[in-house]
């Protein structure tokens, strides 16, 4: 994360700044939600543990055509050190549980806020 470019400046971005921007984007999504987010699309729930960013991307990348989460997908792609493609799944998914994108975003946001408060930026 410390080498992650493109968040607000052309150079490397402090992890706290990157995490804060991701949190702000998720807040923006939840606050501006009018119709069902992403037409009510369902995604795999994930374990909010180590490897969470890649797992979150692996889940959300299977949602296409949803302008509301495009920036989130871009951000998570920046957090995840390896290439992620649609249809790809890791052991971090709770494969028997699908939830709406709106709930996924809320759950992710709550967890990221907790990490930010605790100073866990990496």
């Amino acid at each position: 994360l410390t080498c992650l470019g493109g968040f607000a400046s052309p150079g490397p971005v402090p992890p706290s700044t990157a995490l804060r921007e991701l949190i702000e984007e998720l807040v923006n999504i939840t606050q501006n939600q009018k119709a069902p987010l992403c037409n009510g699309s369902m995604v795999w729930s994930i374990n909010l543990t180590a490897g969470m960013y890649c797992a979150a991307l692996e889940s959300l990348i299977n949602v296409s055509g949803c302008s509301a989460i495009e920036k989130t997908q871009r951000m998570l792609s920046g957090f995840c050190p390896h290439k992620v493609s649609a249809g790809q799944f890791s052991s971090l998914h709770v494969r028997d549980t699908k939830i709406e994108v709106a709930q996924f975003v809320k759950d992710l946001l709550l967890h990221l806020k907790k990490l930010f408060r605790e100073g866990q930026f990496n």
Partner: antibody, heavy 118, light 111 residues
Framework: QVQLKESGPGLVAPSQSLSITCTVS????????VNWVRQPPGKGLEWLGM???????DYNSALKSRLSISKDNSKSQVFLKMNSLQTDDTARYYC????????????WGQGTSVTVSS | NIVLTQSPASLAVSLGQRATISCRAS??????????MHWYQQKPGQPPKLLIY???NLESGVPARFSGSGSRADFTLTIDPVEADDAATYYC?????????FGGGTKLEIK
């Protein structure tokens, strides 16, 4: 398999409007974005605009005042309307579907040829 | 708007040799660690076909002879070795910012 097919009038008189329909199959418009791209004879590609699965519409700012993009999810159709056509709007008009993130255009229709002439 | 400038406008390459096409953007097309630059191939009478996405990722079904590289504002499409079937016009395209824009195209002729 995924298909997109454009249908248009072929010939349009100057100053008149153009309506093109893109009919898609084997995917849902609620979960996919569709772009409109045109190509004048012997020239390059120009992006006109797109409609996202969730309904957001983005236009090429240079053409925004003349363009209207809409869709009917239930009929699997996307519509392009362009007003005040001139001869330099003569082109092949394509609809193209975005793939998953990072939203490159991975499926294209064959295009429909539009000639603006009196 | 981001302007994409391709060079050369046309090139002729011998069968089996390497073809290199450049695409320069008027500003960076990078965001969040990725380059939102894609490459398409268009043959006469056909619609464009996606070859490369995010600067360097090969689209499914595209031969490994095609490769992409670059970041920020400078990108390259390489075909090595060139085959007869590669005669076409190649376009770069960015979607980092709206409006999406295409390069002017590079016509590849096989000698």
């Amino acid at each position: 398999q995924v298909q997109l097919k454009e249908s248009g009038p072929g010939l349009v008189a100057p100053s008149q409007s153009l309506s093109i329909t893109c009919t898609v199959s084997e995917f849902s418009l609620t979960g996919s974005s569709v772009n409109w791209v045109r190509q004048p004879p012997g020239k390059g590609l120009e992006w006109l605009g797109m409609i996202w699965g969730d309904g957001r519409i983005d236009y090429n700012s240079a053409l925004k005042s003349r363009l209207s993009i809409s869709k009917d999810n239930s009929k699997s159709q996307v519509f392009l309307k362009m007003n005040s056509l001139q001869t330099d709007d003569t082109a092949r008009y394509y609809c193209a579907r975005d793939g998953y993130y990072p939203y490159a255009m991975n499926y294209w229709g064959q295009g429909t040829s539009v000639t603006v002439s009196s | 708007n981001i302007v994409l400038t391709q060079s050369p406008a046309s090139l002729a390459v011998s069968l089996g040799q390497r073809a290199t096409i450049s695409c320069r953007a008027s500003e960076s097309v990078d965001s969040y660690g990725n380059s939102f630059m894609h490459w398409y191939q268009q043959k006469p009478g056909q619609p464009p076909k996606l070859l490369i996405y995010l600067a360097s990722n090969l689209e499914s079904g595209v031969p490994a002879r095609f490769s992409g590289s670059g970041s920020r504002a400078d990108f390259t499409l390489t075909i090595d070795p060139v085959e007869a079937d590669d005669a076409a016009t190649y376009y770069c395209q960015q979607n980092n910012e709206n409006p999406r824009t295409f390069g002017g195209g590079t016509k590849l002729e096989i000698k």
